[in-house]
């Protein structure tokens, strides 16, 4: 019962985590304009992995996609890749874990197969969560570096005569969503791995049998062999690699007219 609960909870936690990773990847607020200690501008800038947006003081928001692939910073490309790999692995993990759920009966699937699938999905969730956390952390590091660089250059003008204030960017909501979602996926994966141990079928323990040999009275007690969670040399663990590409459908945002007061 505890195993089923652990597996079910792991699945739900991972599902929420992967949904969060997808949401974070699609969000536009990866970096937002830093308003602290900055001249107050009548526009508000924020950027995502796929497009950058400008919100006018009227509330009108204009977003522009990054239509170049080669012109983008390598770090941004790396973050995109990490997030997409995380989503793909997570999605496959979810698919595998559905069939691995103890509460779902599919034909005459053995418990050892379910245990295998549970561990596979668990590992996938762990890697997926790590990819998301890594992606978000790389982006955050990039922001911190750029923030301090632009702070240092903030008031370097033309011979000190004209002040050109650089727009500084700070952490956006997507980063926090990504960190939490990655963490949840990781936790879900660990729970699946724990559940896998309890799912493995236990081999029958033979009761001690007394053999009476002539001449000597010797009792043989063969030890009870416990199953080694079904992942011994007889079980093949295959790593699943996926090179799935993701096509991005840009969703039209419907901004509020009244974001700014």
């Amino acid at each position: 019962m505890a195993v089923t609960a652990c597996q079910g909870l792991g699945f739900v936690v991972s599902l929420i985590g992967i949904a969060g990773i997808i949401a974070a990847t699609c969000m536009d607020q990866w970096s937002t304009q830093d308003l602290y200690n900055n001249p107050v501008t009548a526009v508000f800038n924020y950027q995502g992995l796929w497009r950058s947006c400008v919100r006018e003081s009227s509330g009108f928001t204009e977003c522009r996609g990054y239509f170049t692939l080669l012109g983008l910073p390598a770090m941004l490309q790396a973050v995109r890749a990490l997030m997409i790999v995380g989503i793909v692995l997570g999605a496959i993990g979810l698919l595998v874990s559905i069939f691995a759920l103890k509460c779902i009966r599919i034909g005459s699937m053995e418990d050892s197969a379910k245990a295998n699938m549970t561990l596979t999905s668990g590992i996938m969730f762990i890697v997926s969560g790590l990819c998301a956390i890594a992606g978000v952390s790389v982006f955050a590091n990039m922001l911190v570096t750029n923030f301090w660089m632009s702070t240092a250059n903030m008031y370097t003008g033309m011979g000190g005569m004209v002040q050109t204030v650089q727009t500084r960017y700070t952490f956006g909501a997507a980063l926090f969503v990504g960190w939490v979602a990655g963490g949840l996926t990781l936790i879900g994966g660990v729970m699946m791995c724990i559940a896998c141990r309890g799912l493995a079928p236990e081999e029958t323990n033979y009761k001690a049998v007394s053999y009476h040999a002539s001449g000597h009275s010797v009792a043989y007690k063969p030890g009870g062999f416990k199953a080694s969670t079904g992942f011994g040399s007889n079980t093949k663990n295959k790593k699943i690699y996926d090179g799935g590409a993701r096509t991005e459908d840009e969703v039209q945002s419907y901004p509020s007219k009244h974001d700014y007061v």
């Epitope: 304009q33 001249p39 107050v40 501008t41 009548a42 526009v43 800038n45 924020y46 950027q47 950058s52 947006c53 400008v54 006018e56 003081s57 009227s58 509330g59 009108f60 204009e62 522009r64 004209v162 002040q163 050109t164 204030v165 650089q166 727009t167 007219k257 009244h258 700014y260 007061v261």
Partner: antibody, heavy 119, light 113 residues
């Protein structure tokens, strides 16, 4: 067509207060932010502040904080500006101007309210 | 506050002439997010409220004759009237539309001979 109709000229004594209005028509009043601009005789333009009629949110030029109070009435599609503790420095033409939704500009202006502060 | 400096303060030309007026801001009005310059030009005829001419430094408002052209980026901007007409007699104001408080230039008064 969009119209911003401002109240008539005002002649007030120093130290008094005055409340001028700007009635909007031809568009959805709550969808656009209303700004107020001051112009002294023969001089340039000065931004006072704005009111968002949707949520009554305001933003003021620091120079006019405590001097101007912006309000609006959704039911009559009217924006108001009250000026307090008037001095001769407040004698000017005051314009209400609608902020464009798609771009950074004032696309429609009222005809202006002339305020004269004199004893 | 951002200081907007317009020059010349007044200008007298004959009809058909080309006119250029300058506007300088104390800080860059270029927004890195969309690469647009938040500078607006207004025309104010005697006894009338200002009228929008150009926004985003170079985008002409609909209904504005194409003889009016805005240019420039960052801190230096120019309004050009390719062939001045009698009805162009007015004061022209540039405005910082990027930083609060919004600030206007002192204006360039255009007079026709």
């Amino acid at each position: 067509q969009v119209q911003l109709k401002q109240s008539g000229p005002e002649l007030v004594k120093p130290g008094a207060s005055v409340k001028m209005s700007c009635k909007a028509s031809g568009y959805t009043f709550t969808s656009y932010v209303m700004h107020w601009v001051k112009q002294k005789p023969g001089q340039g333009l000065e931004w006072i502040g704005y009111i968002n009629p949707y949520n009554d949110g305001t933003k003021y030029n620091e120079k006019f904080k405590g001097k101007a109070t912006l309000t609006s009435d959704k039911s009559s599609s009217t924006a108001y500006m009250e000026l307090s503790s008037l001095t001769s420095e407040d004698s000017a033409v005051y314009y209400c101007a609608r902020r464009g939704y798609y771009g950074p500009y004032f696309d429609y202006w009222g005809q202006g309210t002339t305020l004269t502060v004199s004893s | 506050d951002i200081v907007m400096t317009q020059s010349p303060s007044s200008l007298t030309v004959t009809a058909g002439e080309k006119v250029t007026m300058s506007c300088k801001s104390s800080q860059s009005l270029l927004n890195g997010g969309n690469q647009k310059n938040y500078l607006t030009w207004y025309q104010q005829k005697p006894g009338q409220p200002p009228k929008l001419l150009i926004y985003w430094a170079s985008t002409r408002e609909s209904g504005v004759p194409d003889r009016f052209t805005g240019s420039g980026s960052g801190t230096d901007f120019t309004l050009t009237i390719s062939s001045v007409q009698a009805e162009d007699l007015a004061v022209y104001y540039c405005q910082n539309d990027y930083y609060y408080p919004y600030t206007f230039g002192g204006g360039t008064k255009l007079e026709i001979k």
